[in-house]
């Protein structure tokens, strides 16, 4: 829980807490911004990002963005607040412990994005259909 000496000295809205009143600590994410990638036509890929960061804000989750155009493939890894859009898209899967890629419509390129909320979960990005969250059994696993 929030220690009284901390609580008194700062506005409560600057400290994020969970339902039990425990202070929400930030998670760890791979954070290499945009890098060229060799990940293509695979069920899953590792990010090959060597930088693990403590997210700046406790509410932030891990995000990965995979993009392919005529010239190259890139993978972006960051922390991001799920209340805010990223690349103009809502992070609808932010509560997932795994980073399960979903295709998004972007003109001129193939664009996949995933978000997740466990430490370094954007290190392993999953494209395989067997992980699709339209499967109700998987939803049970994710949200238990």
């Amino acid at each position: 829980t929030i220690p009284p000496h901390v609580q008194k000295s700062v506005n409560n809205d600057m400290i994020v807490t969970d339902n039990n009143g425990a202070v929400k600590f930030p998670q760890l994410c791979k954070f290499c911004d945009v890098r060229f990638s060799t990940c293509d036509n695979q069920k899953s890929c590792m990010s090959n990002c060597s930088i693990t960061s403590i997210c700046e804000k406790p509410q932030e989750v891990c995000v990965a963005v995979w993009r392919k155009n005529d010239e190259n493939i890139t993978l972006e890894t960051v922390c991001h607040d799920p209340k805010l859009p990223y690349h103009d898209f809502i992070l609808e899967d932010a509560a997932s412990p795994k980073c399960i890629m979903k295709e998004k419509k972007k003109p001129g390129e193939t664009f996949f994005m995933c978000s997740c909320s466990s430490d370094e979960c954007n290190d392993n990005i999953i494209f395989s259909e067997e992980y699709n969250t339209s499967n109700p059994d998987l939803l049970l696993v994710i949200f238990q």
Epitope: N20, A22, F25
Partner: nanobody
Framework: EVQLLESGGGLVQPGGSLRLSCAAS???????QMWWVRQAPGKGLEFVS?????????YYADSVKGRFTISRDNSKNTLYLQMNSLRAEDTAVYYC???????????????WGQGTLVTVSS
């Protein structure tokens, strides 16, 4: 009863060094994830550094990378923060905290020390 007691704070000039300690008792220190968290006057919490157990992997906020080093001595139940190349913006109350899952997914509990004040000023 879980207790965390920080020490080692004080007044230091910019560019100087300090070593903070956190003496832990009332729990099995060697199995816990431990953090240093700071709070500058009138500001929110900044999560400075984390050390895992087992394995001792360490992580740092971008603002302190390359300057601060977190470590632990499990035989002494003590957590440390070595702070070098200190800057005025490092002025804050520094807390050690422990955090672990309750077993319910996404739910954690945490314990905090009383904090130690670090002032960086010429």
């Amino acid at each position: 009863e879980v207790q965390l007691l920080e020490s080692g704070g004080g007044l230091v000039q910019p560019g100087g060094s300090l070593r903070l300690s956190c003496a832990a008792s009332g729990f099995t220190f060697g199995t816990e994830q431990m953090w240093w968290v700071r709070q500058a006057p009138g500001k929110g919490l900044e999560f400075v550094s984390r050390i895992d157990s087992p394995g001792g992997r360490t992580y740092y906020a971008d603002s302190v990378k390359g300057r601060f080093t977190i470590s632990r001595d499990n035989s002494k139940n003590t957590l440390y923060l070595q702070m070098n190349s200190l800057r005025a913006e490092d002025t804050a109350v520094y807390y050690c905290a422990k955090r672990r899952p309750t077993g319910v997914s996404g739910t954690f509990y945490d314990y905090w020390g009383q904090g130690t004040l670090v002032t960086v000023s010429s």
